[in-house]
């Protein structure tokens, strides 16, 4: 049925769009760049992404439309709302702070949340990260009892150990939490790269021809027997 | 075998300066962190300052009470450890050992020690 | 800075006598500790290094032992010429800290 199929009879994808037949007389325009609708027969108004702040782009007939995200409006969704025009989003007389595509209640001291409409308990709940122990120094203050290794108003850092470490033996820091922790050359393991690897238990062979392997601190001999001689005895 | 001998010491009037040096021997100087020491006559060990190794890209640390006023470097094609010492106090006066940290937290090979008088 | 506490700062004891000094340190610092064995006019000796270990050469009349923030050094059977002061010293992170010290006289 190809030549009586409309994809050929009637041409119907227009600016160089591609006609593909689905069935004996339904077919889909894949369209160029630059085109759209279901004929190509459109310009992509959307191809030179005109809707702002993260709004969403669709073509009619020639025409974009842009679907705004919430706090934002105008045609290209260029124009933050202003939250704050509107009264009585902030309780207990917080500020309304207006914010791209949002807004932001700073609270009078005794209230907190979004809308300022909760009672501010300096511990409940705790502001103390990473373990630390809040404890409510006034009726509007507190303070963080950090566990070792962090530090902050909240105990937010993570305190950096490395600036004293003795990572041994060419091993290189890497911070822990209140410790530290080093990175071994291949000679040598454990935290601080005070242990020294077995290279005769690593490598069985590492030794040619009959000789024994003898482990040394930081590397390994071979003793060469027969006449053999060199690092692996191989000479 | 492994040796480390100091000099440099002397008397030396309060805020004034001297420059202590210790050369190393039977041992790769670079691959090794090197510590200086000192002790009070009857007193014990206290610990001034170190240069980490090669690997550790020869960072250095101070003792609080000489930070600012000595300088430890090395100079590793005359395996040699320094320790520049300005705007000296009384209670600097001690006998300076210098060190090698064997690798395995021990500080396996010491100086004869050199000792360091500051008076007036 | 991590603190050292060294006990006791003196002991009289008779040859082949055990004598044990312990070093007690304010944080972990992960078996990080030496013992060094000093006598008058002298440079202090490594006796014992990662708390445990015996440095090459040194009589194994010598141990350590401990973990965490507890050391002990141990001398089994005194002898004549173990008569000096001892040092503990951490190693794990600097300021490296030393013992105040532990002399072990002649009873």
């Known amino acids: 049925y190809s030549t009586s199929h409309p994809c050929f009879v009637s041409r119907p994808c227009l600016n160089g769009g591609t006609c593909h037949m689905l069935s004996r007389d339904t077919y889909e325009c894949t369209c160029q760049v630059g085109f759209t609708g279901k004929e190509c027969q459109w310009t992509d108004a959307c191809l030179s992404h005109p809707c702002a702040n993260g709004s969403t782009c669709t073509t009619v007939a020639n025409q974009f439309s842009c679907k705004c995200l919430t706090g934002f409006t105008g045609q290209k969704c260029e124009t933050d709302v202003n939250e704050c025009d509107i009264p009585g989003h902030c309780q207990h007389g917080g500020t309304c702070l207006n914010l791209p595509g949002s807004y932001q209640c700073q609270c009078p001291q005794g209230f907190t949340g979004q809308y300022c409409d909760s009672l501010y308990v300096p511990c409940a709940p705790s502001p103390c990260v990473n373990g630390g122990t809040c404890r409510q120094t006034g009726d509007f203050t507190f303070e963080c009892n950090c566990l070792p290794g962090f530090e902050g108003s909240t105990c937010e850092r993570n305190i950096d150990d490395c600036p004293n470490h003795r990572c041994q033996n060419g091993g290189v820091c890497v911070d822990g939490v209140n410790t530290y922790n080093c990175r071994c050359p291949p000679q040598w393991t454990g935290q601080f790269c005070t242990e020294d690897v077995d290279e005769c238990l690593l490598q069985p062979n590492a030794c040619q021809n009959g000789g024994t392997c003898a482990n040394r601190n930081g590397g390994y001999g071979c003793v060469c027997v027969n006449g053999w001689s060199g690092d692996d005895c191989s000479e | 075998e492994v040796q480390l001998v100091e000099s440099g010491g002397g008397l030396v009037q309060p805020g004034g300066s001297l420059k202590l040096s210790c050369a190393v021997s039977g041992f790769t100087f670079s691959d090794f962190y090197m510590e200086w020491v000192r002790q009070a006559s009857g007193k014990g060990l206290e610990w001034v300052a170190a240069q980490r190794n090669k690997a550790n890209d020869f960072s250095i640390v101070y003792s609080a009470s000489v930070k600012d006023r000595f300088t430890i470097s090395r100079d590793d094609s005359k395996s040699t450890l320094y320790l520049q010492m300005n705007s000296l106090k009384t209670e600097d006066t001690a006998v300076y050992y210098c060190?090698?940290?064997?690798?395995?937290?021990?500080?396996?090979?010491w100086g004869q020690g050199t000792l360091v008088t500051v008076s007036s | 800075d991590i603190q050292m506490t060294q006990s006791p700062s003196s002991v009289s004891a008779s040859v082949g006598d055990r004598v044990t000094i312990t070093c007690q340190t304010s944080?972990?610092?992960?078996?990080?500790l030496a013992w060094y064995q000093q006598k008058p006019g002298k440079s202090p000796k490594l006796l014992i290094y990662?708390?445990?270990r015996l440095q090459d050469g040194v009589p194994s009349r010598f141990s350590g032992s401990g973990s965490g923030t507890d050391y002990t050094l141990t001398i089994s059977s005194l002898q004549p010429e173990d008569f000096a002061t001892y040092y503990c010293?951490?190693?794990?992170?600097?300021?490296?800290?030393f013992g105040g010290g532990t002399k072990v006289e002649i009873k």
């Open positions: 060190s090698r940290d064997g690798g395995k937290w021990g500080l396996d090979a």
């Open positions: 010293q951490q190693g794990f992170k600097y300021p490296l800290t």
């Open positions: 944080e972990d610092i992960y078996s990080g």
């Open positions: 990662g708390a445990s």
